[in-house]
Amino acid sequence: KFSKQSWGLENEALIVRCPRQGKPSYTVDWYYSQTNKSIPTQERNRVFASGQLLKFLPAAVADSGIYTCIVRSPTFNRTGYANVTIYKKQSDCNVPDYLMYSTVSGSEKNSKIYCPTIDLYNWTAPLEWFKNCQALQGSRYRAHKSFLVIDNVMTEDAGDYTCKFIHNENGANYSVTATRSFTVKDEQGFSLFPVIGAPAQNEIKEVEIGKNANLTCSACFGKGTQFLAAVLWQLNGTKITDFGEPRIQQEEGQNQSFSNGLACLDMVLRIADVKEEDLLLQYDCLALNLHGLRRHTVRLSRKNPIDHHS
């Protein structure tokens, strides 16, 4: 139910945190979900548990799978799941979408690119940074703590940035890389109060019980690169991630930029195996940016399967 996606490359270190929040010193047990086999805590193992962290030193493609963590106490246990995927290293330079962390935007005033997940590792400065696989050189680029600062940002600075660092565990070193896209705000652009294109306000969507259903929340925010713009779904006023119904998930659609230059975002709500109780929920498509928030509400109604008899 409470699950988190993590990914890494074979032969690199990967450290995953239990999605159940806890404080240091809490007792956390880890299991490989498919076999219910306990993951050892001894550091001599390639894969071992260390409190809230699960460590793959280094990771192998065969490690992919779902791992269960249980935050244990004498009277109340809390269970979480880590969905881990380890990919083979690419021979070419392109970093596939599935290995990318969230995109960050920058402007002349703010051009920090944080190295994703680095806080989980035992690393020492400096970080190495690459853009589209080329090592960054020149005085415009400054690696500072866990982020890269770019001076005098230009539109050409947009691209995929990879940070590379070394994780040290008991004297052994392991390489880690992480990539995210950096976009540069177009100063000629502008932002508007969000406009939701779909769904229509108070739309009734017909669904079939037992079938899958998709709802798309689509909104436009202005022209050019947008700083802080988001679309999301809520169920009964609660974020999807907090609602705790694994059948209902949201998935980012494609960022769209129409011929007229409008910047738009999609978020698809996927409901697997529609149940009666889903018809009682209120589905809110939310679009927000610095101007404010717009909400369109959808409700589901039962669609009777077509009678094929004459």
Epitope: T27, P74, G244
Partner: antibody, heavy 117, light 111 residues
Amino acid sequence: EVQLQESGPGLVKPSQSLSLTCTVTGFSITSDYAWNWIRQFPGSKLEWMGFISYSGDTSFNPSLKSRISVTRDTSKNQFFLQLNSVTTEDTATYYCASYDGYSFDYWGQGTTLTVSS
Amino acid sequence: DIVLTQSPASLAISLGQRATISCRASKSVSTSGSSYMFWYQQKPGQPPKLLIYLASNLESGVPARFSGSGSGTDFTLNIHPVEEEDAAAYYCQHSREIPYTFGGGTKLEIK
């Protein structure tokens, strides 16, 4: 940020039932944690009363087990305390609080309840 | 039920000095290497606030002048050096078993 807010009648007559509501914002009560009721008597003594967990399981203080129920309304992100057959001994400040299996991390500001005829 | 007995019930400490509060459990609250003892601070009109978890771990955002120690049945909260804002009631609590119980409280006054 997780926030809890208690609400209730303030005054209840002896032998009646007491009903309190805790409204949680910033976090879904079905996502994690156990959601508790704790009371503090006029002399400052604190007493844990019971909880409902994120999965809907409940646990109660045996001293209250025959009188207490804790329920929830997931659509409103609220949980409730019902205490039956109250006496003047139930006069206290009632807190709702989250519990992670170890400690009570987030607390409401408390609501004062007086039992009097 | 595990009974937690706090002492003293109240104490007055000069600014900059050390305050020591004791909590004794009627049976052990430790198991599997962890001591399920917690300390809270409560100021008038406010709910309790967590200071120390698992006997000796400082909660995030709590000043380092607060420290906890102990295992089994005997636990101690130390505040050093005491500051003006530390005037409050302090409670121990265990989560070793149900029901969870609290100590009777210690009121700290700054001289």
